[in-house]
């Protein structure tokens, strides 16, 4: 007769592992035992458990509760043993010796593999602005048994980096995204994407990028020269930005205060039925916690009795 | 052969302990597992727990959690500790070991001792 065994058996951790041992004997044989042990290198035996045909199954003290028989039908010839709830501790090689009648002893030893699935965590790194150069957008960290592999999944430029940790039954595996922050990064999906034979499907962690910046500042309103003029009605002038984090904006005048009437509405300014006394230079101030820019515009309220034309300058200044 | 001689036996009240012990002689040079029968009047012998010569064990349900089976392979002597004994405990109690042979091969002949007498009453 022989045995019938595996090389290698895969479990996942926490769950449980059929370690099989099977004797494929002659006609009129018989299984007596079948006694399972844990037989690393330079650490002996040590008997996990022990199957026999008028006793019953035995399970040492260490494995209380963890070691079963598979459920019926059992063939008599068939020493498999359950190790229930696989934990990384029990990875090692494990030995069947089966004392059959008439043939006596025969012995084969598997390798039992427990894959431990990694629980991979996304760190950002620090805040990205606009103007910086190489910068760390996030890391990715994932822990298992073997090594996890660990990618990343995105549309935005950058350079990846990694770095592995051995412990003593796994490795952690470290990844790195670095990136040249621009605006047009804002909002874009970086995922980490974590790769294992321990897990059914790739574990994917996304992390939504934030750049700070601030847009150069205009002002819009002062198109149509001829719309400025004494009367009119809802002439208003509108102060053009934008940014991360959103920017607040603010009117003043540079030379005096901003006239009774005049309305600010965050980047709007308001005017009621336009006077002379609305002819100034205007400034729009734009500020976020990134940056700020000014924007000012010449206002030259045009009295239609008067032939003279509308003069308008518009400046930026950042 | 193997000889075997249960000690330890005798009168309990119920929720009372005993501990019963057998020593084996003879050709011991391969005793494999080793353990303990009952037979109560007028019923089958049934297991009550056994243990290998590695330690790994086997209980009965019906005594699981009361009773500990321990054994000294240096003296090849095999111990059942009983504890909260029940009136349903009193049974002749039966030391059983068998051998591993050359190469391995498991005897067919399990020994028996003599037995000794457990009786839980009030």
């Known amino acids: 007769g022989e045995l019938e065994t595996s090389d290698v058996v895969t479990v996942v951790l926490g769950q449980d592992a059929k370690l099989p041992c099977f004797y494929r004997g002659d006609s009129g044989e018989q299984v007596g035992q079948v006694a399972w042990a844990r037989v690393d290198a330079g650490e002996g035996a040590q008997e996990l458990a022990l199957l026999h045909s008028k006793y019953g199954l035995h399970v040492s003290p260490a494995y209380e509760g963890r070691v079963e028989q598979p459920p019926p039908p059992r063939n008599p010839l068939d020493g498999s043993v359950l190790l229930r709830n696989a934990v990384q501790a029990d990875e090692g090689e494990y030995e069947c010796r089966v004392s059959t009648f008439p043939a006596g002893s025969f012995q084969a030893r598997l390798r039992l593999r427990v894959l431990v699935p990694p629980l991979p965590s996304l760190n950002p790194g620090p805040a990205l602005e606009e103007g910086q150069g190489l910068t760390l957008a996030a890391s990715c960290t994932a822990e298992g048994s073997p090594a996890p592999s660990v990618t990343w999944d995105t549309e935005v430029k950058g350079t990846t980096s990694s770095r592995s940790f051995k412990h003593s039954r796994s490795a952690a595996v470290t990844s790195e995204f670095h990136l040249v922050p621009s605006r047009s990064m804002n909002g874009q999906p970086l995922t980490c994407v974590v790769s294992h034979p321990g897990l059914l499907q790739d574990q994917r962690i996304t992390h939504i990028l934030h750049v700070s910046f601030l847009a150069e500042a205009s002002v819009r309103g002062l198109e149509d020269q001829n719309l400025w003029h004494i009367g009119r009605e809802g002439a208003m002038l509108k102060c053009l930005s934008e940014g991360q984090p959103p920017p607040s904006y603010n009117w003043t005048r540079l030379d005096g205060p901003l006239p009774s009437g005049v309305r600010v509405d965050g980047d709007t300014l308001g005017f009621p039925p336009l006077t002379t006394e609305h002819s100034g230079i205007y400034v729009c101030h734009v500020s976020n916690e990134f940056s700020s820019r000014d924007s000012q515009v010449t206002v030259d309220v045009l009295d239609p009795q008067e032939d003279s034309g509308k003069q308008v300058d518009l400046v930026s200044a950042s | 052969q193997v000889q075997l001689v249960e000690s330890g036996g005798g009168l309990v009240q119920p929720g009372g302990s005993l501990r019963l012990s057998c020593a084996a002689s003879?050709?011991?040079?391969?005793?494999?597992?080793m353990g303990w029968y009952r037979q109560a009047p007028g019923k089958q012998r049934e297991l009550v727990a056994t243990?290998?010569?590695?330690?790994?064990?086997n209980y009965a349900d019906s005594v699981k959690g009361r009773f500990t089976i321990s054994r000294d392979n240096a003296n090849n002597t095999v111990y059942l500790q009983m504890n909260t004994l029940k009136p349903e405990d009193t049974a002749v109690y039966y030391c059983?070991?068998?051998?591993?042979?050359?190469?391995?091969?498991?005897?067919?002949?399990?020994?028996w001792g003599q037995g000794t007498l457990v009786t839980v009453s009030s």
């Open positions: 003879g050709s011991i040079f391969s005793i494999n597992v």
């Open positions: 059983t070991a068998d051998q591993l042979g050359p190469l391995g091969l498991l005897s067919p002949t399990i020994y």
């Open positions: 243990i290998t010569s590695g330690g790994s064990v």
